[in-house]
Interface confidence: medium
């Protein structure tokens, strides 16, 4: 019985399965386009199993290929608001270490008030992911409208 | 040889890998905003491996963290139709048991005719997921335009 | 020690975990609506572990259920461009073998300049996936704006 349990735990411990789903905490100060995230069961349905938060940014703890996904909804928004405040753009990227800095995922809102996408990308232990929202519109903090997550897929 | 087969089956049986991809069956009666889903190889490319359908709603059979994804396309739609009928909103949530009722994912159509998104969320055995489409526009039943699915990711 | 290593490799080798993330190489000639993809570490963050490219189209090497995802951004685009050139549509489907030809995922741009979606679908060894972009607008080749990938999920 103990052996069977150990078998079950193998993928979680040795193979990874690192996973995180975050909710929006706050936007950055005036000149900082980054969104700051939070996660944990006390906050609702957000969680971190493996990755960690470093000053509101997501830091990877295990090398591998990850599925990165995000949805951001603008708070006070109609299609006319979105087009009038264009360009409002969301970019997800590796922001540190600086030597690995790169944009992974980029979307503009145009006449919509929500963007949602996902992609597979290799990430390394220590990579910190930042999500930059440029423009004057504010994101909704509703947990079903704005969220950001990663899922380890394979080494 | 039998041992190798048993090894292969371990993750499917003991670790889960529950997965479902559903196609739209029909919308609800007048006061019921829920979409009713169907799945199975006889219907095309939809399937249920683990989760079950309960009166067109998806019921979870295994505790864990799931990737939930959805795409809904409005049937007779242009950007002017979509904006004229605004707000048309799609919400995915746990609708039963009532004690766990919560909205997991919400998107508005604004001037678009398709919404698509995905998120990671903890689900428990017995959770039933409902997809509520509010507004007067009808969803397309084309299987490449409207679909809803879940994938077990880890315990 | 060697046994532990073999254990870790089991899921990768015998259970699959085939995965690919591609970047846009080029569009097809006049009458060919297909997008042509490329992948490999020399190109940046794209890769193929299992699936292969056949003249820019993605060929599956292992039977199973896959998560297919795509994002396509139009190159010189505003909401007025997108609506003026409507319909611009993106479809992902099995294009060969001809006996299995089917559309898996379809989205229109309407007044937006980016589409992004994902779905679970059964695929078989030898299936080739094609991505057809119909309309007169051209896709962006920026690797954070346009990408296409698959992830093996379970047998």
């Amino acid at each position: 019985q103990r052996f069977a349990q150990a078998q079950q735990q193998l993928p979680l411990e040795s193979l990874g399965w690192d996973v995180a789903e975050l909710q929006l905490n706050h936007t950055g100060p005036q000149q900082d386009p980054r969104l700051y995230w939070q996660g944990g069961p006390a906050l609702g349905r957000s969680f971190l199993h493996g990755p960690e938060l470093d000053k509101g940014q997501l830091r990877i703890h295990r090398d591998g290929i990850y599925m990165v996904h995000i949805q951001v909804t603008l708070a006070i928004c109609s299609s006319t608001t979105a087009s009038r405040h264009h360009p409002t753009t969301l970019a997800v990227g590796i922001c540190s270490p600086a030597s690995r800095s790169i944009s992974l995922l980029r979307l503009s809102f145009h006449q919509g008030c929500t963007i949602a996408s996902q992609r597979l990308t290799p990430l390394a232990r220590g990579d910190t992911l930042c999500t930059n929202l440029t423009g004057t519109l504010l994101p909704s903090r509703n947990t079903d409208e704005t969220f950001f997550g990663v899922q380890w897929v394979r080494p | 040889q039998r041992f190798a087969q048993a090894q292969q089956q371990l993750p499917l049986e003991s670790l889960g890998w529950d997965v479902a991809e559903l196609q739209l069956n029909h919308t609800g009666p007048q006061q019921d905003p829920r979409l009713y889903w169907q799945g199975g190889p006889a219907l095309g490319r939809s399937f249920l491996h683990g989760p079950e359908l309960d009166k067109g709603q998806l019921r979870i059979h295994r505790d864990g963290i799931y990737m939930v994804h959805i795409q809904v396309t409005l049937a007779i739609c242009s950007s002017t139709t979509a904006s004229r009928h605004h707000p048309t909103t799609l919400a995915v949530g746990i609708c039963s048991p009532a004690s766990r009722s919560i909205s997991l994912l919400r998107l508005s159509f604004h001037q678009g005719c398709t919404i698509a998104s995905q998120r990671l969320t903890p689900l428990a055995r017995g959770d039933t997921l409902c997809t509520n489409l509010t507004g007067t526009l009808l969803p397309s039943r084309n299987t490449d335009e409207t679909f809803f699915g879940v994938q077990w990711v880890r315990p | 020690q060697r046994f532990a290593q073999a254990q870790q490799q089991l899921p990768l080798e015998s259970l699959g975990w085939d995965v690919a993330e591609l970047q846009l190489n080029h569009t097809g000639p006049q009458q060919d609506p297909r997008l042509y993809w490329q992948g490999g570490p020399a190109l940046g963050r794209s890769f193929l572990h299992g699936p292969e490219l056949d003249k820019g189209q993605l060929r599956i090497h292992r039977d199973g259920i896959y998560m297919v995802h795509i994002q396509v951004t139009l190159a010189i685009c505003s909401s007025t461009t997108a609506s003026r050139h409507h319909p611009t549509t993106l479809a992902v489907g099995i294009c060969s073998p001809a006996s299995r030809s089917i559309s898996l995922l379809r989205l229109s741009f309407h007044q937006g300049c980016t589409i992004a979606s994902q779905r679970l679908t059964p695929l078989a060894r030898g299936d080739t996936l094609c991505t057809n972009l119909t309309g007169t607008l051209l896709p962006s080749r920026n690797t954070d704006e346009t990408f296409f990938g698959v992830q093996w999920v379970r047998p």
């Epitope: 929006l24 905490n25 706050h26 936007t27 939070q38 906050l43 609702g44 504010l138 903090r141 | - | -």
Partner: nanobody, 116 residues
Framework: QVQLVESGGGLVQPGGSLRLSCAAS????????MAWYRQASGKQRELVAL???????NYADSVKGRFTISRDNAKNTVYLQMNSLKPEDTAVYYC??????????WGQGTQVTVSS
């Protein structure tokens, strides 16, 4: 817990002005943003103006240039100054506060009627 009490609603002629107040009490240190919503008869509740803890502000298109949201931290109060009022501004106006854990708190609402 956060308690919110609105005041300042009433009947006003088109083109007139009103100032709504929302006084917050309780766990106010936990508040991230405060907002004014409105709900006209038979319509969905809509977000009108939003002010977040670092001072950023957004307005709905329909009120931009006419309404101003502000706050007095010393009094734990948020205001909505409404000028050039129109009949379509008639609604029940609700004060909303959201804490850092994205929990919503609501006031009881105050009626604003714009009519000649």
């Amino acid at each position: 817990q956060v308690q919110l009490v609105e005041s300042g609603g009433g009947l006003v002629q088109p083109g007139g002005s009103l100032r709504l107040s929302c006084a917050a009490s309780g766990s106010i240190a936990s508040i991230y943003h405060m907002a004014w919503y409105r709900q006209a008869s038979g319509k969905q509740r809509e977000l009108v103006a939003l002010i977040i803890s670092d001072g950023k502000i957004n307005y709905a298109d329909s009120v931009k240039g006419r309404f101003t949201i502000s706050r007095d931290n010393a009094k734990n109060t948020v205001y909505l100054q409404m000028n050039s009022l129109k009949p379509e501004d008639t609604a029940v106006y609700y004060c909303n506060a959201q804490n850092w854990a994205t929990r919503d708190y609501w006031g009881q609402g105050t009626q604003v009627t714009v009519s000649s």
